[in-house]
């Protein structure tokens, strides 16, 4: 096995994950590994001599740097915080706060805007991942109900009135709870799913 | 030869107190995260605290948190675990553990031999 | 907190075999993961990290694969030296977690 620094011709190298390209000496040596960077460069005799990243820096990949990547905390004015700090070998991971999605991305979350409010009768639609995109509001489905504007309240189910030895006053909907009475009131009392005594 | 030398091990009561040290040798103490993780007997491998090479990062396991405290000399190369309020439970072989190639956590590459803490009345 | 599960608790398996364990993480963890072998009275010694680097010395029968959620250790052909427990760790988070290992024996 040909361990680098060895010359090429065609100006490709075998592992081009670990090793790259050098066209001044058109050799191949190695790369650095995630979290170190190039102290010394390579040549036709010696190999890349790589560093560790100080403190509050990073290189995430197999890299030929002479620098690392300075850290950055998650910015909590643009809706970002923390979920793992920088190493050296990965950036601080943010995502977006909680009640927050991703409004603006480049390659990560720039930017978090507030979830929009799902109107009574609905919920939001449970996605995937936290945070990736605004809420989509779904109607609640028969059986249940949702009173309030909110992004994050989700469709109750409808009270049963016999579960607690009551009858219907009045059906639920969509947007209100089942009311129920006693049997022995002539009347449907003023109430959501209790019983008035 | 790379190194990591813990002592200060040894039999304490119940809410006693204990300073472990780790002398390291053989590599650039200065820039490596350094870890503490223990092991009670006949238990599994248990990480209590990390500290970054600057001092910036400072993170404790929950059950050690507000009683342990890490420190570091990059002077002395040494690594330090104050013990407070230690209970039965902290009962354990400690070892002194080097992040590979990080100044923040990561594998642990290089390990001591370990010392026996003894909480016991 | 990462929980780490590790499967099964103890094997025992003959010379030669091939032996797997798995660990699964309770969130993903990308890649950063290691797993340690430990021998009675010994401190633990690193054998693979970033989820599948092997570390400098360690014998190439020993291999790994899984990133995310799902990772399996494997032993191709189980030696005598082999013998000893072993641990899966996570390094993508505060709290560092192990999984609770996988004791191996021969049979």
């Known amino acids: 096995q040909v361990v680098p620094p060895y010359g090429s011709e065609n100006q490709t190298c075998r592992d081009q994950e670990k090793e790259y390209y050098e066209p001044r000496h058109r050799i191949c040596c190695s790369r650095c590994p995630p979290g170190t960077y190039v102290s010394a460069k390579c040549s036709r005799s010696r190999d890349t001599v790589c560093a560790t990243c100080a403190e509050n820096s990073y290189n995430e990949h197999w890299n030929y740097l002479t620098i690392c990547q300075l850290c950055r905390p998650c910015d909590p004015v643009m809706g970002l915080e923390e979920i793992a700090p920088c190493t050296s070998k990965r950036k601080t991971q943010c995502r977006c706060q909680p009640g927050m999605f991703c409004a603006a991305w480049a390659l990560e979350c720039t930017h978090c805007e507030l979830l929009s409010d799902c109107p009574p009768g609905t919920e939001a639609e449970l996605k995937d991942e936290v945070g990736k995109g605004n809420n989509h509001c779904v109607p609640c489905k028969a059986g249940h109900f949702q009173n309030t504007s909110s992004p994050s309240a989700r469709c109750q189910p409808h009270t049963r009135c016999e579960d607690q030895g009551l009858v219907e006053a009045a059906p639920g909907t969509a947007q209100s709870d089942t009311t129920c009475r006693n049997p022995s009131e002539s009347l449907p009392p003023e109430m959501s799913g209790t019983m008035l005594m | 030869e790379v190194q990591l030398v813990e002592s200060g091990g040894g039999l304490v009561k119940p809410g006693g107190s204990l300073r472990l040290s780790c002398a390291a040798s053989?590599?650039?103490?200065?820039?490596?995260?350094m870890n503490w993780v223990r092991q009670a007997p006949g238990k599994g491998l248990e990480w209590v605290s990390s500290i970054s090479t600057g001092n910036t990062y400072i993170y404790y396991s929950d059950s050690v948190k507000g009683r342990f405290t890490i420190s570091r000399d990059n002077a002395k190369n040494s690594l330090y675990l104050q013990m407070n309020s230690l209970r039965a439970e902290d009962t354990a072989v400690y070892y002194c553990?080097?992040?590979?190639?990080?100044?923040?956590?990561?594998?642990?590459?290089?390990w001591g031999q370990g010392t026996m803490v003894t909480v016991s009345s | 907190d990462i929980q780490m599960t590790q499967s099964p608790s103890s094997l025992s398996a003959s010379i030669g075999d091939r032996v797997t364990i798995t660990c699964q993480a309770s969130?993903?963890?990308?890649?950063?993961l290691s797993w340690y072998q430990q021998k009675p009275g010994k401190a633990p010694n690193l054998l693979i990290f970033d989820a599948s680097n092997l570390e400098t010395g360690v014998p190439s029968r020993f291999s790994e694969s899984g990133s995310g959620t799902d990772f399996s250790f494997t032993i191709t052909s189980l030696q005598p030296e082999d013998i000893a427990t072993y641990y899966c760790?996570?390094?993508?988070?505060?709290?560092?977690?192990f999984g609770g290992g996988t004791k191996v024996e021969i049979k």
């Open positions: 969130q993903d963890i990308s890649n950063f």
């Open positions: 553990a080097r992040a590979r190639y990080n100044w923040n956590y990561d594998a642990f590459d290089i």
């Open positions: 760790q996570q390094y993508y988070n505060v709290p560092l977690t």
């Open positions: 053989g590599f650039t103490f200065s820039s490596y995260c």
